[in-house]
Structures are given as C-alpha cells and as structure tokens.
C-alpha cells in the first residue's frame, strides 16, 4: 500500500489585499487518525494558522466540512488578506497521540499578496529657487506588493531623466515602499509648470497613480526694475515711475527713497496675473521740482519674497527746471501711488 501523501497542488497563490485566499490540501488516506494543522513557515518558529482539532481561528474557515465522513480535503480559506499574511503555508498531518505526532507535511504553498501602492505624495524644496537653479522633488508611495513597480516623472508632459529611485527593503518583505527624487532645472517660465510622479503597479490594472507638485511653490522669479521720468508738467511737477515687472511670487514691498531718506513704503496686493503667471506693478511719484534747490536722487527700492532689496535710482535735474516763486505749497495727490515731495 502507498503511504500517506499530503498534497498541496499549488506551489504559489497570489491574492489581492482584502480578498480571500484559498489554500488547497488533500490527503491520500484517512489513516492514521489524527488532525491536520496549517502553519505559516517551517521550523520551530512556525506560526499555527489552523487546527482542525482545536482552537479558534476567526479568519480561517475550512473549504470542506471537516466533520464530514471520509473527508480528505483539508483546504482552508483565509479571509480579508493583508500583506502581513504573505508567506509559505504548510498543510501538516499529525498522528493522534499525547501529544500528537507530526507525520507528514505538504510541499507548501507560497501566498503572495498583491497590495496597491498608496497615492504618491510629492514634496518640493523647502525654499524657493530662481531660474537656472536645480531643485529636487521627492515622490513617495508605500505598502505595495509585489516589489516590481515603475515610477516616472514628468514636467509639463515631458518625461524627466535626472531621477534617482529606490525601492525598500531590498530583501523579501510583506510590502514595499518606493522613494524617488527628480532634479528639475527651473526657468522663468515655470510658474505655471507642474511636475507629476506616476506610479504603475500590477494591482492598478494599467491605471497608474499620480502625485503632483506645482513649480509655483518652488520658484522665485526676481523682478526687473525700471525707473523713468515722465515729461515736466505745467505745475513744475515731475512724474517718476518705478516699473517692477515679471516677478513671482506676489510678496513684494516697494520703498521710495528721496536723497536716501524713506519717502513711502507700499505692499503689493491683488495684482493681475500675467499669462506666464508672473506679476507687474507700477508705482508713481510726483516730484515738485520748485521745492528743491539741488538735483533730487530718487531711489525705487524693492524687497521681493524676503530677499535682499534691489535698488534702481534716478536723478531729477532741478537745474533744468527754473523755480517759480511761492511754489512750495503742497501739490494735489492725483493718484493712489502718487505722492508729492517738498
């Protein structure tokens, strides 16, 4: 007669997290009397998963009624599978005794759990950088299995190549994490740009997960400054304009200095956006030439996004404008950003 065989027909079984896993096991004989037990792993540290004889195993149910006469099917179903359930499961026949004696083990069935990666989280640099500088973006996704995964970076739809990606741990694990860093060279046109981290995995059925970051959070576009003088008005007043253009973000403070002394400070707010996402701002200053004996040095000082101030100066030539007697009275304030100098 043939001796007892414990048959586990599948070498491996792959199950999606949250589903049930069926682990098949049949025996070739009902002799000798004694229980079947299921273990995860082998050796002294193995973990008891199910014992027909005794115990309470809420997530494990026998596929066939184990109390049925002539039952030789000791397959089990494990519900609500998580990555922690991955491993090799052994169906083991014991011979009745005190204690029961292990008689024969099946060859084992490796349970692998297909777990979806978490939504990729993209984080950018802690501080802003200007055009021509390189900034790093990091993308992280966790909890996936199996280990094989693909991660791609895109900037405005174009794949990035300066990328470094690691999947951890390197060895076998119940689940894995991916971390990738992309280096992006900024341009002045990147205020509206976006980087996308795209993760593809077998569990996603061809529908990759994406995480995004806006370069507007990472970029600083410093302003251009231009100070100009409009033509002399009939009332001996000169209109001086400071044009601050193509800057981002909007956080900007403008200070007018007259011969080195602070004349007025303004904060930019509610500015209209340019097509490229940058901002422009114009500030005017009315200078009453007749109130000055000497030339006036006007300075437009701009502090942008907490950076060191940028200055642009302009000299109003008083000698070029003959004074009118009694003209040292205040001129009218004719615009929001206009102020008279005495």
């Amino acid at each position: 007669e043939e001796e007892l065989q414990v048959i586990q027909p599948e070498k491996s079984v792959s199950v999606a997290a949250g589903d049930s896993a069926t682990l098949n096991c049949t025996v070739s004989s009902l002799i000798p009397v004694g229980p079947i037990q299921w273990f995860r792993g082998a050796g002294p540290g193995r973990e008891l998963i199910y014992n027909l004889k005794e115990g309470h195993f809420p997530r494990v149910t026998p596929v066939s009624d184990p109390t049925k006469r002539n039952n030789m099917d000791f397959s089990i179903r494990i519900s609500n599978i998580t990555p922690a359930d991955a491993g090799t499961y052994y169906c083991v026949k014991f011979r009745k005794g005190s204690p029961d004696v292990e008689l024969k083990s099946g060859a084992g069935t490796e349970l692998s759990v297909r777990a979806k990666p978490s939504a990729p989280v993209v984080s950018g640099p802690a501080v802003r950088a200007t055009a021509e500088h390189t900034v790093s973006f990091t993308c992280e996704s966790h909890g996936f299995s199996p280990r094989d995964i693909t991660l791609k970076w895109f900037k405005n739809g174009n794949e990035l190549s300066d990328v470094q990606t690691n999947v951890d741990p390197a060895g076998k694990s119940v689940s894995y994490s991916i971390r990738s860093t992309a280096r992006v060279v900024l341009t002045r046109r990147d205020v509206h740009s976006q980087v996308i981290c795209e993760v593809a995995h077998v569990t996603l059925q061809g529908d990759p997960l994406r995480g995004t970051a806006n370069l507007s959070e990472a970029i600083r576009v410093p302003p251009f400054l231009e100070v100009t003088q409009q033509s002399m008005r009939a009332d001996n007043q000169v209109n001086v304009t400071c044009q601050v253009t193509k800057f981002y973000p909007q956080r900007l403070q403008l200070t007018w200095l007259e011969n080195g002394n602070v004349s007025r400070t303004e904060m930019a707010s509610a500015l209209p956006e340019n097509k490229d996402g940058t901002y422009n701002w114009t500030s005017w200053l009315l200078v009453n030439v007749s109130a000055h004996r000497d030339d006036v040095k006007l300075t437009c000082q701009v502090e942008h996004d907490g950076q060191p101030a940028v200055n642009k100066s302009f000299s109003v030539k008083v000698s070029a404008h003959p004074k009118e007697q009694g003209s040292n009275t205040a001129a009218e304030n004719t615009g929001t950003n206009e102020r008279n100098i005495y």
């Epitope: 070739s28 004989s29 009902l30 229980p35 004889k53 009745k96």
Partner: antibody, heavy 115, light 111 residues
Framework: RQLVESGGGLVQPGGSLRLSCTAS????????ISWVRQAPGKGLEYIGT?????ITYFASWAKGRFTGSKTSSTAYMELSSLRSEDTAVYFC????????????WGQGTLVTVSS | AIQMTQSPSSLSASVGDRVTITCQAS????????LAWYQQKPGKAPKLLIY???TLATGVPSRFSGSGSGTDFTLTISSLQPEDFATYYC???????????FGGGTKVEIK
Amino acid sequence: RQLVESGGGLVQPGGSLRLSCTASGFSLSSHGISWVRQAPGKGLEYIGTIGTGVITYFASWAKGRFTGSKTSSTAYMELSSLRSEDTAVYFCARGSAWNDPFDPWGQGTLVTVSS
Amino acid sequence: AIQMTQSPSSLSASVGDRVTITCQASQSVYGNNDLAWYQQKPGKAPKLLIYLASTLATGVPSRFSGSGSGTDFTLTISSLQPEDFATYYCLGGGDDEADNVFGGGTKVEIK
C-alpha cells in the same frame, strides 16, 4: 457498499484463527479497518485498527495475541493463543475513530473457543 | 487508558417520549470531541448515529442529537419511535490512537 466477515468458527483453546473482512463497493486503501467484538449477552469491545504496515494498533489487552494486515479489498486479523473468554461475535468496520468513525459495519462472524 | 461510564444501563419509555442517555469519560476525550454513539438491535451489527460528539451521521433521523465536550456527553432522542427500541453505546477515544473504549451500553425498552 458493504463489509463481509468470514473465517469464524470453533477453535480449541490455545489455537489460532484468521478472520477476513472483505469490502465490496469501495476500496480499503485509504481507510482503516477496525475490529470490535461482542461476547454473548455483553457489550461492545474495541480490539484494534488495521491501517498500512506501520499504522496498525491494538488495545493493550490484545497486543501480542492479535495481529492484522490489509490489502485494498480485504483486511485480516490473526487470533492466536485463543482462550474461552475470546468467544464472541467479531465485527469489522471501516474507520479508525475520531473524525473517521466506524461505519459501515460487517454482519459479524462468531468465534467459539472451546475444547 | 480511558474509561467510559454510560448511564442508565437500561430504561423504559413510551413512544413519543424524550429520552436522554449520558456518557462520562474518566479523562477528557481526544480533541474534547472524540465521542461517537452507536445503536444496536439484537442479532445485528451496530449502526453509527453520532460522531465528533454532535455530528449526525448520514441518513440518521434528526430526532437523534448529541452534545457535550471534554468528559460529559449526552445522546438525546427527542421523540421516541417504535424502531428506536434498541441498545445504545458510546465510544470514546483517549489520546493514544488505540485507546478507544465503549461504554457499557443502555438498553431502551418499551414501557
């Protein structure tokens, strides 16, 4: 699906006998065959179970005197050094207890030990 | 070795009666459930009724039920029928595979 015993009869004290249990309608290869006896007017008494070669076991009182073997269709039990108190109807049944209970049973064969 | 004590050894009952037979083991049976019940009529082989303490064998009427665990077990016939008059045996299994012992039997007779 049934079991049929044979081989019973009259035997002298100290003698031997070989009982057979033949299955029809099913194979014995994956099942144990257990033997139970019943002395006249008494209750049932478990003797032992015949499995494969090494998986054959007998109640402590029957060890040494009773042995067994099995093919895919027939189980045998050898009775030796018979005594008058071994007089009984001998039943065979498929199964080895616990989750493999004794079912079905043969009709029984009478063994009489007398001089 | 395990010992099985069955009670009562005999009882008289009428058709329709509820009948309870008990079986006590000298130690916990194997797996707390290695207990079977058999019915035997005169001149016939025993017939399996219940195994694993409470599992009804195929073809056995549902008026038969088994309960218990460890050392104390019960066979109940909810409504005795004329064909139920017979002798009932429990069979308990100890931890050793050859340690299978029948109780002394309970003869159910017509009152």
